[in-house]
Each structure stands twice: as structure tokens, then as C-alpha cells.
Amino acid sequence: KFSKQSWGLENEALIVRCPRQGKPSYTVDWYYSQTNKSIPTQERNRVFASGQLLKFLPAAVADSGIYTCIVRSPTFNRTGYANVTIYKKQSDCNVPDYLMYSTVSGSEKNSKIYCPTIDLYNWTAPLEWFKNCQALQGSRYRAHKSFLVIDNVMTEDAGDYTCKFIHNENGANYSVTATRSFTVKDEQGFSLFPVIGAPAQNEIKEVEIGKNANLTCSACFGKGTQFLAAVLWQLNGTKITDFGEPRIQQEEGQNQSFSNGLACLDMVLRIADVKEEDLLLQYDCLALNLHGLRRHTVRLSRKNPIDHHS
């Protein structure tokens, strides 16, 4: 219960806190468990104890082992154990699982990635951040205090993020890196009454007789996956599939496109070889979901020939 796993890389600083807490006034003694040898408190040592903290400046692979901390008060003693493992630096980019801190998940509204264990160190801004070993660049990434903020989070932002900072101890600088995975979760979806973005209600669309014309019915239905969302065209109140005019067809495929996080659908009405009688029809763009149905009506008008001036 009072044992804590800690890990670090050779030649980096590692600071470990005693798993047993006590008042700052309590003394804490540290021992190397295998030998029961006391850890010195003098800062000239590479490994030394400083109250509740055990410092490896820098760490070496041979430092791996179990360390015992005893918190001593006037009335009781509390014992804790720190299981420390120091690993050799990897030559390649991959960060092995055993060096990973807990995974954090973010969303469009909350995309903070905290640098693990940083509060144990004496560091000064700025933090450096890397994703999959590449330094993060661009205005979407902001290193703020002890965390990274990612603007407009996308699923592609998932990955392994490493923070790098400098620990200062009595004027000497030591590098520290820590890596954790970041996953992107969808915001809770919602649906709303359909909003038709195009066409405008009672829009007049100019077309040329004998030419082809396209009308796009575009509507948004909420955010996330929508159970029922559909857009379609009707001619004079009749569905295109029942209208029986082969020149006038809906484009197949109502794929959900997510713009600004909204679930939107497009349906294109293709009129081949526009005829005079097409101008007499009423074209209805319908958007339907569980909240109801919205209809926008379009009419066609003949495009006036362009005057050519010399």
C-alpha cells in the first residue's frame, strides 16, 4: 500500500517523494533497502535525501532498487517504500511502455496535457514539448506553466507527448524528460432541430435553358454521430424517386461531414438539360431528424442573356 513505483533515465535528474506523508517538521530518514545503508543528506553526493524527497542528480542504472523512507514524529514512525528503476537511454525514438506515465484524454473543450512529476523539481519555464519525438511547432500548441494546451483538438493529436525541462540544484542543471500518452475522446454528441444552410428559404436560382443545373441541399443536425439525419429533395411535393423525370436526379450518398464539429449532410439535385417546364416546378430541400422536419423552397428562373457591350 505504501510502496510507490518510480522510474527515470540514466544521466537525467530523478526526484522521488516518500509515499508516506508527514508534517514538514517531521524528520524523514532514507535507506537503501538491500543494504539497509542510510542515504546521506549532504548535497555534494550524487544521490542524497532532502526531507521527504530522494534526489538522484543525475541518476545511474546502478541506482535501481527499493528505497525505504521512515517518517519520524514524536509519537509514531511511518515506513514507506520507493521502488526505483533507472533505464538506459533509448537510441531510437520509441518510448517503451515502462517509461510511460498515466494516459490522459482530452477533447475539443479540454486539451491540457500536464507534465508528469514536474512539481517535484525546481524548474523554470519554458517547458519543451515533443510528440512522437518531434518538437511541437505551430500556433495550436501552447506551453503554459506545467502543461501543454492544444487548440482545436483533432483525433490526429492522439499520441505520445514528452515534456522536457531543466532541474536546477545549487546552480547545477540537470535534464528531465517525462512521457505520457494522450487520447482524444469525442465530446458528448447532441442533436438539434435541423438547420438548413443552403438553399435560403424562397431562394430564386438562375439557370440557363438547355444547360445543366445543380442545387445543393445542405443541413446540420447537431454534433457527433446522428441516429436519424437525412436531407432530400422533393419536386412539387413529390419525392424525386417517385417523380419519374430521369433528367432530374438526386446525387447518391449522404455522407456525414463534420465542419466545426457539426454533423452536416449534403444532397445535390442534378437537373440535366434544363427545360422551360422545370421553371414551373417547386423544389423543396427537406432536412429531417428526430426533432422534426424543416423545408426550404427554391424556384428556378431563366438567366438573362449577358449584354455584350463593345
Epitope: 437525412a230 422533393q234 411535393g237 417517385d242 422534426g292 424543416r294
Partner: nanobody
Framework: EVQLVESGGGLVQPGGSLRLSCAAS????????MGWFRQAPGKERELVAV???????KYADSVKGRFTISADNSKNTAYLQMNSLKPEDTAVYYC???????????????WGQGTLVTVSS
């Protein structure tokens, strides 16, 4: 006046089939979007299937591959073919239609009286 009359409900054993019919009148059937909803005891009414046009149908995940919605414009009738029925399909099934107005909220769909489907051994 819009009228929707459901039929075809009844008691069926798990794994069995039923075909529900919805006879419509009082509106232009070929222009309407037809749907089947259901309401189990103590639960909210949920959409089961909808037919938008002869090429476009939508189904609740729980019935996909088992239920089929269709419509016959010549008979002004919508159908729900239900196969591989499960006890959890037990509910009152309602036929609904939407169309006509510029905006129609969900509560303004036209509804039938419902037909009870009981799946039990």
C-alpha cells in the same frame, strides 16, 4: 384529416416474425416520410425505422438486419417486417408520418393508435 391505422401486432415466440401494416389516408402519401416508433412499458418512445424515399431507409441499431421498412404508394400503406424477434422487442408499435409544413417538430408528426407486439415463449 390525417389517419394512420396500424395492424398486424400480436403474440409471437422468440425468433418468430410479424409484419405490421400502416394504412394512411388524408394526405399525399407519396410525399410523406413514414416511420415506425415503439414504446415499451416504462420506457420512452423510440424510433425503430424510417423510410425517406424508395432508396433511403434508416434503422435503430437494435433492429438493423432484422427489421425492414417499406412503403407501397399505390396502396397508401407502410410496412414493418420484423424477423428474429426478441423478448426486448415487446412494445406498442406506432406508425407515424411527417410532411407538408415548412417546419414540423417531432411532436407534430401524425401518429396512429399503435399495435401491441408481444414476444414471449
Amino acid at each position: 384529416e390525417v389517419q394512420l391505422v396500424e395492424s398486424g401486432g400480436g403474440l409471437v415466440q422468440p425468433g418468430g416474425s410479424l409484419r405490421l401494416s400502416c394504412a394512411a389516408s388524408g394526405f399525399t402519401f407519396s410525399s410523406a416520410i413514414m416511420g415506425w416508433f415503439r414504446q415499451a412499458p416504462g420506457k420512452e418512445r423510440e424510433l425503430v425505422a424510417v423510410i425517406i424515399d424508395s432508396r433511403t431507409t434508416k434503422y435503430a441499431d437494435s433492429v438493423k438486419g432484422r427489421f425492414t421498412i417499406s412503403a407501397d404508394n399505390s396502396k397508401n400503406t407502410a410496412y414493418l417486417q420484423m424477423n428474429s424477434l426478441k423478448p426486448e422487442d415487446t412494445a406498442v408499435y406506432y406508425c407515424a408520418a411527417v410532411g407538408g409544413a415548412t417546419t414540423v417538430t417531432a411532436s407534430e408528426w401524425d401518429w396512429g393508435q399503435g399495435t401491441l407486439v408481444t414476444v414471449s415463449s
